[in-house]
């Protein structure tokens, strides 16, 4: 098909040679008035943001991507020729960086429903360059972590060395959807939840005397929990004495809260102290009874078939430990009166 009628957009991807990073192209089809296809389920021309990813309708995921070879050969279907480029609905994902990704990419609807739809296409001229700016040694990573439950921020890698005052207006997308309120080079998150994770794209416009182009960077954001700085605490038993009936069976439960650790090796065990002797008791396996993002509660029971006079002289000690330290709670049995 004739691509001379396609709207054109220039993009720059400056990649870091130090890290793995991805890139995306959105199928930003032209404004609604250009064709029936583009009109469908779109906002009115006044409402359409400058770069609106092509989302939101069943039709809209049905686009075809091509690359235009530089030697003038016919257009190539992306899916057939480029294994490192993946099409996901209206988005083209580049899985590996490299100057060989430079070129012209064209997208258009698969279904041409009217003669007007032929011109409903967009040509993206992508220039890919390795980052050479040595002055910005600490530019933001393309993989950023947010600590769950705390305040955090997501920085646009291509602008992270600029102050907020110098920074141009930035257009942000999250998982392909425009974040219309965000315009600065940093998104501040007051309290981080799991839904803040995802693929973020930041765009800003650069221009010289001849032309202007969009500088784009992609940030993969993960939400993580920080390792605990606390040793485990014992929630139960609380009291250090327990009233019991002689001759009856008894179960004493030890419930301990362990803070999150990426490498999690919790220890929870019972041992008995009798005068100068102490020994570990083989008791049923520990089991997790509650799990949250920040902690896990583990229970382990000691079971006495029947309480004897000797047991009243002993101390039953629950011992819990993580990588930070340990805690103990001892229980002395006391005969119930009456």
């Amino acid at each position: 098909f004739n691509i001379s009628g396609c709207s054109t957009k220039k993009l720059l991807w400056t990649y870091s040679t130090r890290s793995e990073e991805e890139f995306v192209l959105f199928c930003d089809l032209p404004e609604p008035q250009k064709s029936h296809f583009c009109h469908r389920n779109r906002l009115s021309p006044k409402q359409v943001p400058e770069h609106l990813p092509f989302m939101g309708s069943n039709d809209l995921s049905d686009v075809q991507w091509y690359q235009q070879p530089s030697n003038g050969d016919p257009l190539e279907d992306i899916r057939k020729s480029y294994p490192h480029i993946i099409q996901d609905k209206c988005t083209l994902h580049f899985l590996t960086p490299g100057v060989n990704n430079s070129g012209s990419y064209i997208c258009r609807p698969k279904m041409i429903k009217s003669p007007y739809d032929v011109a409903c296409c967009v040509k993206m001229i992508l220039e890919v360059k390795p980052q050479t700016n040595a002055s910005c040694e600490y530019s933001a990573s393309h993989k950023q972590d947010l600590l769950l439950g705390s305040t955090g921020s997501i920085s646009c890698p291509s602008l992270s060395c600029q102050s907020d005052a110098q920074s141009p207006a930035v257009t942000w997308y999250k998982n392909g959807k425009l974040l219309s309120v965000e315009r600065s080079n940093r998104i501040v998150v007051d309290e981080v939840y799991d839904y803040h994770q995802g693929t973020y794209v930041c765009d800003y416009t650069q221009s010289d005397t001849v032309s202007s182009w969009t500088v784009r960077a992609v940030v993969q954001v993960r939400t993580i929990v920080g390792d605990t700085k606390l040793k485990p605490d014992i929630l139960d038993p609380v009291e250090d004495t327990l009233e019991v009936e002689l001759g009856k069976p008894l179960t004493i439960s030890c419930k301990a809260r362990f803070g999150f650790e990426r490498v999690f090796n919790p220890v929870i065990k019972w041992y008995i102290k009798d005068s100068d002797l102490e020994w570990e008791v083989s008791v049923p396996e520990a089991k997790s009874i509650k799990s949250t993002l920040k902690d896990e509660i583990i229970e382990r029971n000691i079971i006495l078939e029947k309480v004897t006079q000797r047991d009243l002289r002993r101390k039953f000690v629950c011992f819990v430990q993580n990588s930070i330290g340990n805690t103990t709670q001892s229980v002395q049995l006391k005969e119930k009166r009456g």
């Epitope: 769950l148 799991d194 994770q197 995802g198 509650k290 949250t292």
Partner: antibody, heavy 115, light 111 residues
Framework: SVEESGGRLVTPGTPLTLTCTVS????????MGWVRQAPGKGLEYIGY?????TPYYASWVNGRFTISKTSTTVDLKITSPTTEDTATYFC?????????????WGPGTLVTVSS | AAVLTQTPSPVSAAVGGTVSISCQSS????????LSWFQQKPGQPPKLLIY???TLASGVPSRFKGSGSGTQFTLTISDVQCDDAATYYC???????????FGGGTEVVVK
């Protein structure tokens, strides 16, 4: 988003698996719970599955249900349904990856157990 | 298992007025504050209003207020609107998740 599927009419004793499909977030950082509601009755807590994949059940469950998950789905298996299990079953996400602040719910799927 | 007892239904409220619903737990909830409140309208899934006993969930009007600690909790709706007509449930979470349970629900009728 969260959406349940698999609800249908089954005869007593026929195992049934309900599936909750999630999108837009990862099950590695969100706990998912199952809640049911018999026609005209209140909500009943069944259990949840933690970010690490460990299931936790309400004490009344006693092996009647099994919760498991893959990377994008959470399953609830009703091992041997009885007529008392007739209800709308909801799947819900706890953003705080706990087991009580369910802030995203599916529309529910109806299970009818009848002979 | 824990038992959560809510204010009996139905509770009547006038538009612009205030209504309070109580939720009493048979044992202390985890951290003394792991209790949430939900609103449910017929044919819809529940909607989270309050978690952590008093923290307002995202997008919930500040007319909804949760209070209480340990075993006794209250949901207060001030400046009641017609749209607040619904059934409200509390959900308690405990040291052992096997004790987790909903209250029986309280229907709020707006006049």
């Amino acid at each position: 988003s969260v959406e349940e599927s698999g609800g249908r009419l089954v005869t007593p004793g026929t195992p049934l698996t309900l599936t909750c499909t999630v999108s837009g977030f990862s099950l590695s950082s969100a706990a998912m719970g199952w809640v049911r509601q018999a026609p005209g009755k209140g909500l009943e807590y069944i259990g949840y599955i933690s970010t690490s994949g460990t299931p936790y059940y309400a004490s009344w469950v006693n092996g009647r249900f099994t919760i498991s998950k893959t990377s994008t789905t959470v399953d609830l298996k009703i091992t041997s349904p009885t007529t008392e299990d007739t209800a709308t079953y909801f799947c819900a996400r706890d953003s705080y990856a706990g087991d009580y602040a369910f802030n995203l719910w599916g529309p529910g799927t109806l299970v009818t157990v009848s002979s | 298992a824990a038992v959560l007892t809510q204010t009996p239904s139905p509770v009547s409220a006038a538009v612009g007025g205030t209504v309070s619903i109580s939720c009493q737990s048979s044992k202390s909830v985890y951290n003394n504050n792991w209790l949430s409140w939900f609103q449910q309208k017929p044919g819809q899934p529940p909607k989270l209003l309050i978690y952590g006993a008093s923290t307002l969930a995202s997008g919930v009007p500040s007319r909804f207020k949760g209070s209480g600690s340990g075993t006794q909790f209250t949901l207060t709706i001030s400046d009641v609107q017609c749209d607040d007509a619904a059934t409200y449930y509390c959900l308690g979470s405990y040291i052992s998740s096997s004790d987790n349970a909903f209250g029986g629900g309280t229907e709020v009728v707006v006049k």
